[in-house]
């Protein structure tokens, strides 16, 4: 009696269980009562990443430099190419089909988390006692200068965008 289901890594065709092609190979011809499944390796720049019965291999992803992309990991016959973004850019989606420039943190904000190839810069406001006077994708908020430790006094208080201004003791008013 012909089978209604096949084992793992097999497929049912013409009331017969045939072996699937292994990753990195495509199907040329189904098995018969007398012959095994015929498979062929994928060509250059092609891949198949599962046990399959595909008659065509998939094209490797193209990391388009015009979209800010570069190759992170070269594809093989069994794996797709993995793209990432050029330095200073990050992917717009999980599939990383295009890139955008990392966000900079404005003055008054510091970098909480530096951007990666897949995530943007995370900024945070500088709290009292800290400042950032630059727009940067790397700089954290800096602590205000301690005038006291320099035997000076605060002449002008700091803000979230400016450091304190220290001056000599005798200029206290």
């Amino acid at each position: 009696e012909p089978p209604t289901a096949c084992r793992e890594k097999q497929y049912l065709i013409n009331s017969q269980c045939c072996s699937l092609c292994q990753p990195g190979q495509k199907l040329v011809s189904d098995c018969t009562e007398f012959t095994e499944t015929e498979c062929l390796p994928c060509g250059e720049s092609e891949f198949l990443d599962t046990w399959n019965r595909e008659t065509h291999c998939h094209q490797h992803k193209y990391c388009d430099p015009n979209l800010g992309l570069r190759v992170q990991q070269k594809g093989t016959s069994e794996t797709d190419t993995i793209c990432t973004c050029e330095e200073g850019w990050h992917c717009t989606s999980e599939a990383c089909e295009s890139c955008v420039l990392h966000r900079s943190c404005s003055p008054g904000f510091g970098v909480k988390q530096i951007a990666t190839g897949v995530s943007d810069t995370i900024c945070e406001p500088c709290p009292v006692g800290f400042f950032s006077n630059v727009s940067s994708a790397f700089e954290k908020c800096h602590p205000w200068t301690s005038c006291e430790t320099k035997d000076l006094v605060v002449q002008q208080a700091g803000t979230n965008k400016t450091d304190v201004v220290c001056g000599p003791q005798d200029r206290l008013r």
Epitope: P127, G129, K140, V153
Partner: antibody
Framework: QVQLVQSGAEVKKPGSSVKVSCKAT????????IEWIRQAPGQGLEWIGS????????NYNEKFKGKATFTADTSTSTAYMELSSLRSEDTAVYYC???????????????WGQGTLVTVSS | DIQMTQSPSSVSASVGDRVTITCRAS????????????LAWYQQKPGKAPKLLIY???TRESGVPDRFSGSGSGTDFTLTISSLQPEDFATYYC?????????FGQGTKVEIK
């Protein structure tokens, strides 16, 4: 020990001004922020602003710009807050409190004055 | 400006009760550089100035009984009185000191049941 002693209660006419004082003892007055807070009758606390006596640097809550003016006299360790163009809505208890001491890590208000009641009434 | 929202606005409790007051900030008060939450709690009794209880969200001020504790991080904070004493009936305020202007919660009045 740290102490902040404020001037006594005031009754003022609408349109007039009042100057509330806060005398500090027991710490280095010039390098510690003096914070000013108000509390209208039956209401919560509202930060007005602050002054660093040694430098004269100030921070004002936008809401009180033009209403409150802070000054400080380091020779007497006294901070002042002047309230101008008084209206009935300015009736409140006004507190001074000590803020950061120059360490940049003590921004909370650890010592408070006893409060000054300012009543604005015609 | 950072808004501070306290709840409940009042709570009736008995001596010995555990009382919890919550405070929510409209933005995070946690600063990544020093991992500190810029939040304080104050107690105020009628006709008196407020008194500092807790700073940095969970550090008890010197002399404050250990039945008072603060917890939370980011935007959500809690003041807990583990066993309410007669002298604890008062109004409690949270306050942030992350950036100007400093703002307070609207207060929670703890009343005798």
């Amino acid at each position: 020990q740290v102490q902040l002693v404020q001037s006594g209660a005031e009754v003022k006419k609408p349109g007039s001004s009042v100057k509330v004082s806060c005398k500090a003892t027991g710490y280095t007055f010039s390098t510690s922020w003096i914070e000013w807070i108000r509390q209208a009758p039956g209401q919560g606390l509202e930060w007005i602003g602050s002054i660093l006596p040694g430098s004269g640097s100030t921070n004002y809550n936008e809401k009180f710009k033009g209403k409150a003016t802070f000054t400080a006299d380091t020779s007497t360790s006294t901070a002042y807050m002047e309230l101008s163009s008084l209206r009935s809505e300015d009736t409140a208890v006004y507190y001074c409190a000590r803020g950061d001491d120059g360490s940049y890590v003590r921004w909370y208000f650890d010592h408070w004055g006893q409060g000054t009641l300012v009543t604005v009434s015609s | 400006d950072i808004q501070m929202t306290q709840s409940p606005s009042s709570v009736s409790a008995s001596v010995g009760d555990r009382v919890t007051i919550t405070c929510r900030a409209s933005q995070s008060l946690l600063f990544s550089v020093n991992q500190k939450n810029y939040l304080a709690w104050y107690q105020q009794k009628p006709g008196k100035a407020p008194k500092l209880l807790i700073y940095w969200a969970s550090t008890r001020e010197s002399g404050v009984p250990d039945r008072f504790s603060g917890s939370g991080s980011g935007t959500d904070f809690t003041l807990t009185i583990s066993s309410l004493q007669p002298e604890d009936f008062a109004t409690y305020y949270c306050q942030h000191y992350y950036s100007y202007p400093w703002t307070f919660g609207q207060g929670t009045k703890v009343e005798i049941k």
